[in-house]
């Protein structure tokens, strides 16, 4: 009774190649570039995602202050290493064997090394700070109502928990979502807030992920509400490691 | 193989009740969320009311406080408690479900569903 099963594409993911050769003829779909099962019922994995992206063809403030070890994705796009089961390899390198750590979010975590480099452990981003500026508006949005319209949008959307959701702070212009997800919180089957970041990140954009939808829509009180610009900031759980010379 | 068979559907006089009941089959887990969903003839399908792993609840606001979503996870059965029923309120009533836990009403997040049982409500 699935838009997939109907016929056969991925509602959640544009990204794929779908055909009916799953059991019994089932419709099974395929990231681009790596070719895994995706389950369509859910969000696909941002590691996935930017792998099928790379393979595409080309074309008393209430705002919280983000800690020292807060990283913002500064890199861009890579082609990135997938385990199995879709997440993020500890360690990626690229074509000319300039290798790093990442975390869950695939974010880089350490300074660049050779093909030398360890990384133990792929650490888990347990805090996302979404910080958002909307364009200029008649008069401020009630805090309240944009509070709702964004928890809605994150369970409705992004198949988010509303438990991880943990706050969404408002100074006009700027909107701060935290996410929050521990990897006690975490179970099977529960979509992951670094993937829910990401196909946010990409609505706002003009992106959109999902296939046959229209794009984001985000009203509040029937008021149209306009990113200008997104900034995400990823907090791990373990702090990362990089050295002096890149803070100065 | 997952299964869901819906049961409870029949005709109403405005301003009945009826009880839907869901049960479910084949799951090797109890972490899945489940929902209510229904389909009048010509027209989408919409999200009713959900309940996710926790037993949090969600519904679509034209139902809220009229009807209650529940679950026994020990019968693996899914219920819809639908009070001062109204003629739009006639459709065809699915039990859906969804590995994981969340609280959504749009049916995308749903991947396996029952053949349905009708509602009637008559003026």
């Known amino acids: 009774h699935t838009a997939a099963q109907d016929n056969c594409t991925c509602p959640t993911n544009k990204m794929t190649v779908c055909s009916p050769d799953g059991p019994g003829g089932r419709c099974q779909c395929r990231a681009l570039g790596s070719g895994v099962a995706v389950d369509c019922s859910t969000l696909t994995s941002k590691c996935l995602l930017l792998k099928a992206r790379m393979s595409a063809p080309k074309n008393a403030r209430t705002l919280v202050r983000p800690n020292e070890h807060a990283l913002v994705d500064n890199d861009g796009l890579y082609d990135p290493d997938c385990d199995p089961e879709g997440r993020f390899k500890a360690r990626q390198c690229n074509q000319t064997s300039v290798c790093w750590c990442v975390n869950s979010v695939g974010v880089r975590r350490t300074d660049k090394g050779d093909l030398s480099l360890r990384c133990d452990e792929l650490v888990r981003t347990h805090h996302i700070l979404i910080d958002l500026r909307h364009r200029p508006t008649a008069g401020a949005f009630n805090h309240s109502d944009l509070d709702a319209e964004l928890r809605r949008l994150f369970r409705e959307r992004y198949r988010l928990h509303p438990k991880f959701v943990a706050a969404v702070h408002y100074e006009q212009p700027t909107i701060q979502i935290e996410l929050r997800q521990n990897t006690s919180q975490k179970a099977a089957g529960d979509v992951d807030i670094g993937d829910a970041a990401y196909y946010f990140e990409r609505d706002v954009k003009g992106e959109s992920l999902f296939q046959g939808r229209g794009g984001l829509d985000l009203r509040v009180r029937g008021e149209p509400l306009q990113v200008e610009r997104t900034l995400i900031y990823y907090l791990d759980e373990i702090p990362p490691k990089f050295s002096m010379k890149r803070l100065t | 193989q997952v299964q869901l068979q819906e049961s409870g559907g029949g005709s109403v006089q405005a301003g009945g009740s009826l009880r839907l009941s869901c049960v479910v089959s084949g799951y090797t887990t109890t972490r899945y969320s489940m929902a209510w969903f229904r389909q009048a003839p010509g027209k989408e399908r919409e999200g009713v009311a959900g309940?996710?792993?926790?037993?949090?609840?969600t519904y679509k606001p034209s139902v809220e406080g009229r009807f209650t979503i529940s679950r026994d996870s020990a019968k693996r059965t899914l219920y819809l408690q639908m009070n001062s029923l109204k003629p739009e309120d006639t459709a065809m009533y699915y039990c859906?479900?969804?590995?994981?836990?969340?609280?959504?009403?749009?049916?995308?997040?749903?991947?396996?569903w029952g053949q349905g049982t009708q509602v009637t409500v008559s003026s």
């Open positions: 859906a479900t969804g590995t994981g836990n969340f609280l959504a009403l749009d049916p995308v997040w749903y991947n396996t």
């Open positions: 309940i996710d792993t926790d037993v949090l609840t």
